[in-house]
């Protein structure tokens, strides 16, 4: 009982003077308040509290369940308690069976006694099993039992205050232990998609995941550069006893080109935080972005192959794509494919294999391209070169001589005189007249050069060598000179 | 002692709304999850909405997402439900009811407001 | 979403029977689930958490169990009070559903 000190308020007095005091049960129980400031009686047991403003407690037949502590406060405040037992031998433990414990922190397993004077108050696991080994407890008779520093492995414990009542082992009703998981990780995060591309006044969708032990992990949406609350809808789950997942989606009903930028999804607990973003491209309309892999001027030599190769970005997805050559459409030697499988691919291939090409077969290539938005080309511009040929040679009436070639590039025509019957001709003569005849033509395709020499110069047998040659080889033509008298009996051109 | 009213229920036609409105009393509604529950005339209970103890996380049954939302004002301990675009099918008896914590379930409910959609 | 299947929708027992309602989860909601008694007029009143823990006040002739998919309300000697109809509904994910119901009437 409190001592008093005159000339400062002091706590109320009780009747019966004790801390503690044990009735049998159907008994009375009888407190006295003596405060002349008195203003009334608490009652507490578990989660139960009753008031009383008399300042005599009667219970006339006490129950197991009158077991608790009585306090007496008066006007200034202060307070005097009294803990009663209420004996029952059918009612050994009074129990609230909800058992959480949080992970790594004591916890309750509230069973007080209703008699005091029991031995070996403890903890007992459920069936007879054993508890785990390194499971601590502290017994209190008038709150209960502590078990301390909760584990996870604890989780779904079963297990019952126990107590030797006259020698017999009794137990309370059964508790199942909640753990409640530490946090002792950041929380996992991931993002359905890490970029979007959409153009004005789609929809704008993105869902973030997040995982953790419990759900008292925090999540949120943030722009970057911006404090907006962004509007979000939730999902959640629960696999198990420590994995939950949360979906938090993120809708833009309606984006607009100012919507572009990135967004992160940020999730903490009290471990620390984690976070991952997406990023969102909004475009006013769609494109096509065409890249020649190879140049756009071609030179292939004769009877090779070629493939015409272009990357290019189309969004929304492209939804024709041909290749053009002389206003015809190829329909097969062509494939066009994603550069990726991911699903955010904007960027495509496509490739126009030419085979064994002919000279004939030189040109402008088209590819074109389109998607609901907009068209989009490039031209390739293919040369193919081919080893001069020797179109015609000839003596003309007024006595020059003539050699027409056909090459590309533009074939060079060279002329030599070999004296006799000589094979290898190296004295040069120089042409009188040269020509390109096909200048202003087709841009593609072999180029015609014509020479002419004057074959009045020549005063002895022998033979004229025209040679016609240019980066792919050479022809050469020849024409046998024969004199009888002072004539040239025969000219006989061959090659 | 915990104590739940509802309020806010009413006739309305279809298309129209309505906000119920759930006056919390003996705990502090930022410490518990709070639910909205219904129950059509003779049928069977029906999840509607959840709202986090942080009032962070909303969650919505398919019936009625886009249409309703339920909020909090921590200061005047209410819990609401803003219903939009009613439906004939929405008439029902409106429960709110808080979420023990840990998933434990729905340990205190409203009496209910009923609400009837109809022209 | 998780569909609740609880049978029987209806039943018929007398004072002091032992009664067994049982609920299907459609997919593992591990020990998620909420046990509810509605009577007529009346809000529903939390019986059982998490599959099989007691709520707060609620006499000990009721029990639950189970794990995963399957679980079970059992009322060991049913009493006059005990006349209503009992719903299960899961909280393991969003959105949380309840089972048909169950209604409990006097034989």
């Known amino acids: 009982q409190p001592s008093v000190s005159p000339g400062e308020p002091s706590p109320p007095s009780i009747h019966p003077a004790k801390s503690e005091l044990i009735v049998r049960v159907g008994n009375e129980i009888r407190l006295l308040c003596i405060d002349p400031g008195f203003v009334k009686w608490t009652f507490e047991i578990l989660d139960e509290t009753n008031e009383n403003k008399q300042n005599e407690w009667i219970t006339e037949k006490a129950e197991a369940t009158n077991t608790g502590k009585y306090t007496c406060t008066n006007k200034h405040g202060l307070s005097s308690s009294i803990y009663v037992f209420v004996r029952d031998p059918a009612k050994l433990f009074l129990v609230d069976r909800s058992l959480y414990g949080k992970e790594d922190n004591d916890t309750l397993v509230r069973c007080p006694l209703t008699d005091p004077e029991v031995t070996s108050y403890s903890l007992k696991g459920c069936q007879g099993k054993p508890l785990p080994k390194d499971l601590r407890f502290v017994p209190d008779p008038k709150a209960g039992i502590t078990i301390k520093s909760v584990k996870r492995a604890y989780h779904r414990l079963c297990l019952h205050c126990s107590a030797d009542q006259e020698g017999k082992s009794v137990l309370s009703d059964k508790f199942i232990l909640k753990v409640r998981p530490a946090f002792k990780a950041v929380p996992v995060v991931s993002v359905s998609k890490a970029s979007y591309l959409l153009r004005e006044g789609e929809e704008f969708t993105v869902t973030c995941t997040i995982k953790d032990v419990s759900s008292s992990v925090y999540s949120t949406w943030k722009r970057e550069n911006s404090q907006t609350k962004l509007q979000e809808k939730y999902n959640s789950w629960h696999h198990g006893d420590f994995n939950y997942e949360r979906q938090a989606t993120l809708t833009i009903s309606s984006a607009r080109v100012n919507d572009s930028g990135v967004f992160m999804c940020y999730a903490n607990n009290t471990f620390g935080s984690a976070n991952v973003t997406t990023t969102l491209e909004v475009v006013d309309k769609g494109f096509i972005n065409i890249f020649p892999m190879i140049n756009t001027t071609v030179f292939v030599n004769d009877g090779e192959n070629v493939d015409l190769i272009v990357e290019y970005e189309a969004f929304p997805k492209p939804e024709h794509q041909q290749w053009i050559y002389m206003n015809r459409t190829f329909t097969d030697k062509w494939e066009d494919y994603p550069k990726s499988e991911n699903e955010s691919n904007i960027r495509y291939v496509s490739e126009l294999h030419l085979t064994r090409l002919k000279g004939t077969e030189g040109g402008t290539y088209t590819f074109l391209v389109s998607n609901s938005d907009v068209n989009a080309s490039i031209a390739f511009n293919v040369y193919v070169n081919t080893k001069p040929e020797i179109l015609t040679y000839d003596r003309l009436v007024n006595g020059m001589l003539q050699c027409v070639a056909a090459g590309f590039p533009e074939p060079t025509i060279d002329w030599y005189f070999c004296p006799g019957t000589e094979q290898r001709c190296s004295a040069s003569v120089l042409p009188v007249d040269v020509q390109t005849l096909n200048a202003s033509g087709p841009p593609f395709g072999k180029l015609v050069v014509q020479s002419s020499i004057d074959s009045s110069a020549f005063k002895h047998n022998g033979t004229v060598e025209c040679k016609a040659y240019n980066d792919v080889g050479k022809t050469s033509a020849y024409f046998n000179f024969a004199f009888k008298g002072n004539n040239k009996e025969q000219i006989h051109p061959h090659t | 002692e915990v104590q739940l009213l509802e309020s806010g229920g009413g006739l309305v036609q279809p298309g129209g709304s309505l906000r119920l409105s759930c006056a919390a009393s003996g705990f502090t509604l930022t410490s518990y999850a709070m639910s909205w529950v219904r129950q059509a005339p003779g049928k069977g209970l029906e999840w509607v909405s959840t709202i986090s103890g942080s009032g962070g996380y909303t969650y919505y049954a398919d019936s009625v997402k886009g249409r309703f939302t339920i909020s909090r004002d921590n200061s005047k301990n209410t819990l609401y439900l803003q219903m939009n675009s009613l439906r004939a099918e929405d008439t029902a008896v409106y429960y709110c009811?808080?979420?023990?914590?840990?998933?434990?379930?729905?340990?205190?409910w409203g009496q209910g407001t009923l609400v009837t959609v109809s022209s | 979403d998780i569909q609740m299947t609880q049978s029987p929708s209806s039943l018929s027992a007398s004072v002091g029977d032992r009664v067994t309602i049982t609920c299907r989860a459609s997919q593992n909601i591990y020990t998620y689930l909420n046990w509810y008694q509605q009577k007529p007029g009346k809000a529903p009143k939390l019986l059982i958490y998490?599959?099989?823990s007691l709520h707060s006040g609620v006499p000990s002739r009721f029990s639950g169990s189970g794990s995963g998919t399957d679980f079970t309300l059992t009322i060991s000697s049913l009493q006059p009070e005990d006349f209503a109809t009992y719903y299960c509904q899961q909280s393991s994910s969003t959105p949380y559903t309840f089972g048909g119901g169950t209604k409990v009437e006097i034989k």
């Open positions: 009811a808080r979420d023990s914590g840990y998933d434990r379930g729905l340990d205190y």
């Open positions: 998490d599959a099989s």
